[in-house]
Interface confidence: low
Amino acid sequence: AWELTILHTNDVHSRLEQTSEDSSKCVNASRCMGGVARLFTKVQQIRRAEPNVLLLDAGDQYQGTIWFTVYKGAEVAHFMNALRYDAMALGNHEFDNGVEGLIEPLLKEAKFPILSANIKAKGPLASQISGLYLPYKVLPVGDEVVGIVGYTSKETPFLSNPGTNLVFEDEITALQPEVDKLKTLNVNKIIALGHSGFEMDKLIAQKVRGVDVVVGGHSNTFLYTGNPPSKEVPAGKYPFIVTSDDGRKVPVVQAYAFGKYLGYLKIEFDERGNVISSHGNPILLNSSIPEDPSIKADINKWRIKLDNYSTQELGKTIVYLDGSSQSCRFRECNMGNLICDAMINNNLRHTDEMFWNHVSMCILNGGGIRSPIDERNNGTITWENLAAVLPFGGTFDLVQLKGSTLKKAFEHSVHRYGQSTGEFLQVGGIHVVYDLSRKPGDRVVKLDVLCTKCRVPSYDPLKMDEVYKVILPNFLANGGDGFQMIKDELLRHDSGDQDINVVSTYISKMKVIYPAVEGRIKFSTGSH
């Protein structure tokens, strides 16, 4: 028997520095977690103690904090090189700055293979990107070899900006021939490393013949055997065992997100490359694990540029940006309109001639808007200003919901109207009319939504049975502010870009902004 230790991360999302327990900015260092300096300590400790160790990342290192906004992926290459990662799979967010934003800072600088078997380049890009990422890589580990085959969510064109010269194929269809190729090369231990979410990870384990282990990402899935060490609730045991169609037991793992845990899986193979046993658990990277001093010093050096950036002007406003709770929790506010417009703009993806865009709607809880921005400071807007408006370090995500769920959400928005509660929704691509004289649960008298399958966008009545795409804060997707119906009834959920980054990019693009209150939210006569 031969034993392999797989260390794995996924969906780190730019958390290079340690964070608080909820993965937001670290406030009390004695209770902070994660970060690359702490990760390095644990990885080195395991490498010294065990003979056959692989350190793998399942994608979405990009996007999530000011680190990515400023360094645009150079920080990912630098610190992953420093930690000596063995391989990485491409995630959807690796394409957030386009293909160039992946090639230059990461693909050309990484000293480890970057993988995806189901992304095929065409046209002029094919020769430019050739060899910079691979479908698979055979890695020597001790006296043996291990094949790593990569995959990426085929939804990436809807979630990021890969351009028109990359084709995202069905994961299973694309993986099988690559695994078969590895088998012909006499590689009998194969890990599928990728970024398509836990459901697809399980399908890959079930369907792709020859895959021994699946290391996944994208769905931020937390698996754990025994009593979990922090706030995350396990979606299943670690590893999660799938019985493949040809009768093998295939371990599937994921390690939550944000670098809070280091996945730790021990696999025992027989001489024919069959998995005999698998066990392990994610390791919580809490303050009991010291930060490595050399990596920490490097982090501090890179940090200086971030502090300078946060006070630089991103753009100007020539109007007061009303983000006060007196406005945003009671009526349409122009800060809400600005944020929603930025959210839609960030999701412009022309992937189908029949649609002007794949999504037109935004909802945003008024309670998530924490500050106004005064235009009387020469109109200047900085990252620091936006951090006061959106201080929680959330993301703006893409969900699919039935019309009936949206109707419930808008009823919830005003079910206890007048108490300055955070659930009052700000909107984009939606016209809503409330009648507050009616009883709670029956106050939405008109709900029109902007069409997507149209060349000239116009507002049509919401259809209860139709499935709509909506951009909203991850807080709402997770049922926050009492929006349990969204969490319970959503049909799909893909995590998006950092909230501040979305708004700052939009302001930088527009240069001068002047959002108005324009009748997106109305109250019918006599009730308000």
Epitope: T173, P177, R209, G247
Partner: antibody, heavy 117, light 107 residues
């Protein structure tokens, strides 16, 4: 119980397009599985035409790639077959079925199509 | 494409007899093989998946065997309801292909 039901025109003229609908009850086509079109020629030969996966990806038989399109309406839990430029060779019984990366465990009863002027 | 070759094309047998139908794949399909039974004017019905696992509700007189490229379907003690046409089909990759069928008739 899962049920599939095909519907379509029965007779189509050569060079025209064929459109068929498969209505699924008892299971959401967005939940899992692949949703297929299969046809059976008069001599009983079965041919897999293509599928649409639960999340909307298509895979077609290369012999039909330039003529076939499979789409869906998730709100009605239906998926559709469109076959362009039909000839007498497309005369067959058309079945919809659930499966693809699994065997076809549920089939519709089939709809007979004749291509004739 | 993977070709599926079924034999015999037709077979006559009596109630109570045992028959075997074979199917050969042009390439290794591991255990990704299904068997179907079809009656005149009806849709095919799944009998066996993964080469040897009986589908739900299929009587135990049916059994599948084989892996790689050679497969067989055996029916012990034929019953009147067993007459019809039998097809094998691989689902190793696309395009999915069927055998030409074996027509089992009452002698």
């Amino acid at each position: 119980d899962v049920q599939l039901q095909e519907s379509g025109p029965g007779l189509v003229k050569p060079s025209q397009s064929l459109s068929l609908t498969c209505s699924v009850t008892g299971y959401s086509i967005t939940s899992r599985y692949y949703w297929n079109w299969i046809r059976q020629f008069p001599g009983n030969k079965l041919e897999w035409m293509g599928y649409m996966t639960y999340d909307g990806t298509n895979n077609y038989n290369p012999s039909l790639t330039n003529r076939i399109s499979i789409t869906r309406d998730t709100s009605k839990n239906q998926f559709f077959l469109k076959l362009n430029s039909v000839t007498a060779e497309d005369t067959a019984t058309y079945f919809c079925a659930r499966g693809g990366w699994d065997p076809f465990d549920y089939w519709g009863q089939g709809t007979t199509l004749t291509v004739s002027s | 494409d993977i070709q599926m070759t079924q034999s015999p094309a037709a077979l006559s047998a009596s109630v109570g007899e045992t028959v075997t139908i074979t199917c050969r794949a042009s390439d290794n399909i591991y255990s990704y093989l299904a068997w179907y039974q079809q009656k005149q004017g009806k849709c095919p019905q799944l009998l066996v998946k993964n080469a040897k696992t009986l589908a739900e509700g299929v009587p135990s007189r049916f059994s599948g065997s084989g892996s790689g490229t050679q497969f067989s379907l055996r029916i012990n003690s034929l019953q009147p309801d067993d007459f019809g046409t039998y097809y094998c089909q691989h689902y190793y990759g696309t395009p999915l292909t069927f055998g030409a069928g074996t027509k089992l008739e009452l002698k």
